[in-house]
C-alpha cells in the first residue's frame, strides 16, 4: 500500500515523493533498500534527498531499485517504498507502455491534458508538447500552465502526448519528458436524419446574366463527431465533375461548423458568368449520413435589372 512505482529516462531529471505523507516539520530519511545505505542530503550529489523528495539530477540506469523513506515524528515513524526504474532513451519514436502515465479522456467541451508529475519540479513556462513525437503546431493547441488545451477536439486527436520541460536546481537545468495517452469520447453525441438549412426546398434564386453566382448547401447531422456527414451538389442529377461545365464548380472541401453543438456542413457551388442555359438546370443540394439522404432542389431565375429611367 505504501509503495509507489516511479520511472524516468537516463540523463533526465527524476523527482520522487515519499509515498508516506507527513508534516513539513517532520524529518524524512531516505535509504537505498538493497544496501540499506543512507541517501545524502547534500545537493552537490547527483542523487540526494530533500525532505519528502528524492532527486536524481540527472538519473542513470544504475539508479534503478527500491528506495525506503522513513517519515520521523516525535511520536511515530512511517515507512514507505519507492520502486524506481530508469530506462535507456529509445532511439525510435515509440514510447513503450512502461513509460506511459495514466490515460486521460477528453471531449469537445473538455480537452485538457495535464503534464504528469510536473508539480514535483521547479519549472518555468512554457511547456513543450508533442504528439506521436511531432511538435504540436497550430492555433488549436494551447499550452496553458501545466496542461495542454485542444480546441474543437476530433477523434483524430487521440494519441500519445508528451510534455517536455526544464527543471532548475541551483542554476543547473535538467530536461524532463512525460508521456500519456489521450482518448476522445463523444460527449452525448447523436446522429439524426440530415436537416438541410439552406437552400429551402424548391427555392428560386435570382441571378444576373453575365455575373457570378454562389449557391450554398448547408445541412446539420446531429451532435458531436459524425462517422459520415457529407454535403454535395448535383446538376440535373449528375455530379458536377461529370456535367462538364467548367464555369460551374463545387468548392473543394466541406466547411464544418458547430452551432449550438450541432455538427453542420456547408458546400458552395460557384457559377461563373451566369448564362441563359444555366436557368434551365436543376440544382440539387444533397445531405448524406448513415440515416440516409435528403435533397433540396434549387432553380435559377433571371433577376430583372433595376430600371433607372426617370
Amino acid at each position: 500500500k505504501f509503495s509507489k512505482q516511479s520511472w524516468g529516462l537516463e540523463n533526465e531529471a527524476l523527482i520522487v515523493r515519499c509515498p508516506r505523507q507527513g508534516k513539513p516539520s517532520y524529518t524524512v530519511d531516505w535509504y537505498y533498500s538493497q544496501t540499506n545505505k543512507s541517501i545524502p542530503t547534500q545537493e552537490r550529489n547527483r542523487v540526494f534527498a530533500s525532505g519528502q523528495l528524492l532527486k536524481f539530477l540527472p538519473a542513470a540506469v544504475a539508479d534503478s531499485g527500491i528506495y525506503t523513506c522513513i517519515v520521523r515524528s516525535p511520536t511515530f515513524n512511517r515507512t514507505g517504498y519507492a520502486n524506481v526504474t530508469i530506462y535507456k532513451k529509445q532511439s525510435d519514436c515509440n514510447v513503450p507502455d512502461y513509460l506511459m502515465y495514466s490515460t486521460v479522456s477528453g471531449s469537445e467541451k473538455n480537452s485538457k491534458i495535464y503534464c504528469p508529475t510536473i508539480d514535483l519540479y521547479n519549472w518555468t513556462a512554457p511547456l513543450e508538447w508533442f504528439k506521436n513525437c511531432q511538435a504540436l503546431q497550430g492555433s488549436r493547441y494551447r499550452a496553458h500552465k501545466s496542461f495542454l488545451v485542444i480546441d474543437n477536439v476530433m477523434t483524430e486527436d487521440a494519441g500519445d502526448y508528451t510534455c517536455k520541460f526544464i527543471h532548475n536546481e541551483n542554476g543547473a537545468n535538467y530536461s524532463v519528458t512525460a508521456t500519456r495517452s489521450f482518448t476522445v469520447k463523444d460527449e452525448q453525441g447523436f446522429s439524426l436524419f440530415p436537416v438541410i438549412g439552406a437552400p429551402a426546398q424548391n427555392e428560386i434564386k435570382e441571378v444576373e446574366i453575365g455575373k457570378n453566382a454562389n449557391l450554398t448547401c448547408s445541412a446539420c447531422f446531429g451532435k458531436g463527431t459524425q462517422f459520415l456527414a457529407a454535403v454535395l451538389w448535383q446538376l440535373n442529377g449528375t455530379k458536377i465533375t461529370d456535367f462538364g461545365e467548367p464555369r460551374i464548380q463545387q468548392e473543394e472541401g466541406q466547411n464544418q461548423s458547430f452551432s449550438n453543438g450541432l455538427a453542420c456542413l456547408d458546400m458552395v457551388l460557384r457559377i461563373a458568368d451566369v448564362k441563359e442555359e444555366d436557368l434551365l438546370l436543376q440544382y440539387d443540394c444533397l445531405a448524406l449520413n448513415l440515416h440516409g439522404l435528403r435533397r433540396h432542389t434549387v432553380r435559377l431565375s433571371r433577376k430583372n435589372p433595376i430600371d433607372h429611367h426617370s
Epitope: R294, R295, T297
Partner: nanobody, 121 residues
Framework: EVQLVESGGGLVQPGGSLRLSCAAS????????MGWFRQAPGKEREWMGV???????YYADSVKGRFTISADNSKNTAYLQMNSLKPEDTAVYYC???????????????WGQGTLVTVSS
C-alpha cells in the same frame, strides 16, 4: 428502390485478405453513395465505410488502414477490400446504397442480403 447483390464472402485465415463486391441494379439513377456494414451474431449493426458519388470515402475507426472501399461507376459496383483480417471480423457483411429518383426528397439506405465472412484458422 435499389437492388444490391453482395459476393466474395467465405472462409479466410487470420491475417489474410478478402475482396467483397456489391452490384447495384434497379433505380440506380442518381445513386449518391454506397457503403458496407456488418453484423456479427448477437451484436449491433456496425458500419465499415461509405463511398460517396464524388469519390470521397469515410471509414470507421475500427477498420481504418485495413479496409478500403472503392467503386466502379460504369459497372454500378462497390468493393470492400479487407486486409489483415482478424477473428473478430467474422460477420455477415451487407452492402448499402442510397440515392433514388431526383423527385424523392428523403431516402433511407437500401441494403442487400449479405455475404458471410468467417476468419478462422
Amino acid at each position: 428502390e435499389v437492388q444490391l447483390v453482395e459476393s466474395g464472402g467465405g472462409l479466410v485465415q487470420p491475417g489474410g485478405s478478402l475482396r467483397l463486391s456489391c452490384a447495384a441494379s434497379g433505380s440506380i439513377y442518381s445513386l449518391v453513395a454506397m457503403g458496407w456494414f456488418r453484423q456479427a451474431p448477437g451484436k449491433e449493426r456496425e458500419w465499415m465505410g461509405v463511398i460517396a458519388y464524388d469519390g470521397s470515402t469515410y471509414y470507421a475507426d475500427s477498420v481504418k488502414g485495413r479496409f478500403t472501399i472503392s467503386a466502379d461507376n460504369s459497372k454500378n459496383t462497390a468493393y470492400l477490400q479487407m486486409n489483415s483480417l482478424k477473428p473478430e471480423d467474422t460477420a455477415v457483411y451487407y452492402c448499402a446504397a442510397v440515392g433514388g429518383a431526383t423527385t424523392v426528397t428523403a431516402s433511407e439506405w437500401d441494403w442487400g442480403q449479405g455475404t458471410l465472412v468467417t476468419v478462422s484458422s
